[in-house]
Interface confidence: low
C-alpha cells in the first residue's frame, strides 16, 4: 500500500496585512480514515488554527468543500491577515480513533506578513537653540514587516549625514519599529527651514512616507540692538530710538531705563515678518532734556524668549543742550552691544 503523503507545496507565502492568505495542503490518499487539522508552530506548544470537526474559527475557511466524498484538498484561507498571524503553518493528518492519532505532518508553510510602516512622526528638541548649535530631531515609525527598511533625513531637500538609526527588535518578530536621530547644525537663516524624515519600505510600492518638522520650533535667533538719537526738537525733547533686529521667535520684551530707573516696558506683538522669517522692532523714547540737570544715561534692555537681558546704553549730554536753544548735537554712545551666548 502506498504511503500517505501530506503535501504543502509552498515553503513560504508572503501576504499584505489586511489581505487573505491561502495555505495549500493536499493528501495523496483517502486512507487511512481520519481528520486533517491545521496548526501554527510545531511541538507541544503548537496552536490549533483549523479543525473541520469542531471549534469556531471565524477567519479560517476551507478552500474546497471538505465534507465531499473523495476530497483530498484541505487548503485553507485565512482572512484579514495581521502581523500577529506570521509563523509556520502545518497541515497534519490524523488516524481516526479514540483518541485520534497523529499520522503525518506536511513540511510546513511559513507565512510572512507585509505590513506598512506607520506615518513617520518627527519630534524636535524640547528647548530652542541658537545658530551654530546642534539640535537633534527624532523620527519614529512602527508596525512594519518585513524588517528591511530605509530611512533618510533631509534638510531643505539636502540629505543629512549625521544620523543614527535603529530597527527593533533585533531578532525575529511579527512587526518592527524604526527610530532615527538626526543632528542638525542651526544657522540664523533656518527659521523657514524644514527637516523631513523619509521612510521607504517594500509595502509602499516606491512611494515613501514622510514626516516633517519645522526648524522654526527649534531655533532662537537673538536680536541685534542699535540705539540712535534723532535731532533735538524745538521743545528741548530728544527722540531716542532702539532698533531690535533679526530676532526669532517674536516673544520679546523691551524696557527703557533712565539713569537705571524703569521708564517704560513694551511687549512685541503682531510684527511683520522679514523674508528670512525673523522680526524687527523699533521703540522710541522722548527725553525732556530741560528736566535734567546732569547727563542722562539711557538703557534699552531687551529680554528675548525668556533669555537673560541684552542691554545697550548711552548718555545724552545735557551740557551740550543749552536750555534756551534747540541744538542738534548728537548723543554720545557709551554703550556696547552686550550679547549673551546661550
Amino acid at each position: 500500500e502506498e504511503e500517505l503523503q501530506v503535501i504543502q507545496p509552498e515553503k513560504s507565502v508572503s501576504v499584505a496585512a489586511g489581505d487573505s492568505a491561502t495555505l495549500n495542503c493536499t493528501v495523496s490518499s483517502l486512507i487511512p480514515v481520519g481528520p486533517i487539522q491545521w496548526f501554527r508552530g510545531a511541538g507541544p506548544g503548537r496552536e490549533l488554527i483549523y479543525n473541520l470537526k469542531e471549534g469556531h474559527f471565524p477567519r479560517v475557511t476551507p478552500v474546497s468543500d471538505p465534507t465531499k466524498r473523495n476530497n483530498m484538498d484541505f487548503s485553507i484561507r485565512i482572512s484579514n491577515i495581521t502581523p500577529a498571524d506570521a509563523g509556520t503553518y502545518y497541515c497534519v493528518k490524523f488516524r481516526k480513533g479514540s483518541p485520534d492519532v497523529e499520522l503525518k505532518s506536511g513540511a510546513g508553510t511559513e507565512l510572512s506578513v507585509r505590513a506598512k510602516p506607520s506615518a513617520p512622526v518627527v519630534s524636535g528638541p524640547a528647548v530652542r537653540a541658537t545658530a551654530e548649535h546642534t539640535v537633534s530631531f527624532t523620527c519614529e515609525s512602527h508596525g512594519f514587516s518585513p524588517r528591511d527598511i530605509t530611512l533618510k533625513w533631509f534638510k531643505n531637500g539636502n540629505e543629512l549625514s549625521d544620523v543614527q538609526t535603529n530597527v527593533d527588535p533585533a531578532g525575529k518578530s511579527v512587526s518592527y519599529s524604526i527610530r532615527s536621530t538626526a543632528r542638525v547644525v542651526l544657522t540664523r537663516r533656518d527659521v523657514h527651514s524644514q527637516v523631513i524624515c523619509e521612510v521607504a519600505h517594500v509595502t509602499l510600492q516606491g512611494d515613501p512616507l514622510r514626516g516633517t518638522a519645522n526648524l522654526s520650533e527649534a531655533i532662537r535667533v537673538p536680536p541685534f540692538l542699535e540705539v540712535t538719537q534723532q535731532s533735538m526738537r524745538a521743545d528741548n525733547q530728544v527722540n531716542v530710538t532702539c532698533q531690535v533686529t533679526k530676532f526669532y521667535p517674536q516673544r520679546l520684551q523691551l524696557t527703557w531705563l533712565e539713569n537705571g530707573n524703569v521708564s517704560r516696558t513694551e511687549m512685541a506683538s503682531a510684527l511683520p515678518e522679514n523674508k528670512d522669517g525673523t522680526y524687527n522692532w523699533t521703540s522710541w523714547l522722548l527725553v525732556n532734556v530741560s528736566a535734567h540737570r546732569d547727563d542722562v544715561k539711557l538703557t534699552c534692555q531687551v529680554e528675548h524668549d525668556g533669555q537673560p537681558a541684552v542691554n545697550k546704553s548711552f548718555s545724552v549730554k545735557v551740557s551740550a543742550h543749552p536750555k534756551e536753544q534747540g541744538s542738534n548735537t548728537a548723543a554720545e554712545n557709551t554703550g556696547t552691544n552686550e550679547r549673551n551666548i546661550y
Epitope: 496585512a17 489586511g18 506598512k116 506607520s118 506615518a119 512622526v121 509595502t203 510600492q205 512611494d207 512616507l209
Partner: antibody
Framework: QIQLVQSGSELKKPGASVKVSCKAS????????MNWVRQAPGQGLEWMGF????????TYAQGFKGRFVFSLDTSVSTAYLQISSLKAEDTAVYYC????????????????WGQGTLVTVSS | DIQMTQSPSSLSASVGDRVTITCRAS??????LAWYQQKPGKSPKALIF???YRYIGVPSRFSGSGSGTDFTLTISNLQPEDFATYYC?????????FGQGTKLEIK
C-alpha cells in the same frame, strides 16, 4: 506653502449638476489621497470618500454612490467633485482635504483642508 | 459603521481655564484618531493625529490622549482664539467617521 484652493459658491436648481474643483499647490497632488467632506448647514462633518490620486481610483462612502463622482486632472493638480440630479438636501459646504497618502490602508487624518465650497440647491 | 460620540455637546469656559473633551468610539479604533478645530465660516484645522501627536504649529496647550475606544482632547490655559467647535474622527475603518462636535463657548 501647501494650499488647497476650491472653486466659488454655486446656486443651482433641483435636477441640475455642479462641479466643484480643488486645486492643490505646494506639494505633488499624486503623493496624497484627496478626500471630500460634506457639512450641511449647522451640522457636523460627513466623509464622502476619497480618490487615489496616483491611480485615479475613487472610493465612495455608502450614502454617496451614484450621483457623486470624484475625478482628477493631475496636469493642473486639481481634484473635482461632480454632483448630478441635485436635490435640496445636497445644500451644504463641500470640503476637499488631503490625507498622508494613498498607500495608507486607513486613509489617515486630514492634515490640510480647502476653504470649502457652498453649494445651494433651491428652486 | 463606527459611531463616534463626543461629550459634552457644548461647554462654557473662561480664558485661562483647562477643558477636556471626550470622544468614544463604538468599537476599537486603536490610535487611529484625529482631532480638528473649526471656527464659524471656516474650514476645519487639524490639531492632533494618531490620538496624541500634535501637528506642526499647534500650540502645546492642546494635548490628546487615549487608545482603543476612549479618547480625550485637553486644552490647558484656554486662549480667546480657542473658542470654536471641536471634532474627533476615526480613521481605523472605512467609512471614516466624525464625532458630532463639541462647541466651546466663552463664559
Amino acid at each position: 506653502q501647501i494650499q488647497l484652493v476650491q472653486s466659488g459658491s454655486e446656486l443651482k436648481k433641483p435636477g441640475a449638476s455642479v462641479k466643484v474643483s480643488c486645486k492643490a499647490s505646494g506639494y505633488s497632488i499624486t503623493d496624497y489621497a484627496m478626500n471630500w467632506v460634506r457639512q450641511a448647514p449647522g451640522q457636523g462633518l460627513e466623509w464622502m470618500g476619497f480618490i487615489n490620486t496616483y491611480t485615479g481610483e475613487p472610493t465612495y462612502a455608502q450614502g454617496f454612490k451614484g450621483r457623486f463622482v470624484f475625478s482628477l486632472d493631475t496636469s493642473v493638480s486639481t481634484a473635482y467633485l461632480q454632483i448630478s440630479s441635485l436635490k435640496a438636501e445636497d445644500t451644504a459646504v463641500y470640503y476637499c482635504a488631503r490625507t498622508r497618502g494613498y498607500y495608507d490602508f486607513d486613509g489617515g487624518a486630514f492634515d490640510y483642508w480647502g476653504q470649502g465650497t457652498l453649494v445651494t440647491v433651491s428652486s | 459603521d463606527i459611531q463616534m460620540t463626543q461629550s459634552p455637546s457644548s461647554l462654557s469656559a473662561s480664558v485661562g481655564d483647562r477643558v477636556t473633551i471626550t470622544c468614544r468610539a463604538s468599537q476599537n479604533v486603536g490610535t487611529h484618531l484625529a482631532w480638528y478645530q473649526q471656527k464659524p465660516g471656516k474650514s476645519p484645522k487639524a490639531l492632533i493625529f494618531s490620538a496624541i501627536y500634535r501637528y506642526i504649529g499647534v500650540p502645546s496647550r492642546f494635548s490628546g490622549s487615549g487608545s482603543g475606544t476612549d479618547f480625550t482632547l485637553t486644552i490647558s490655559n484656554l486662549q480667546p482664539e480657542d473658542f470654536a467647535t471641536y471634532y474627533c474622527q476615526q480613521y481605523n475603518t472605512y467609512p471614516l467617521t466624525f464625532g458630532q462636535g463639541t462647541k466651546l463657548e466663552i463664559k
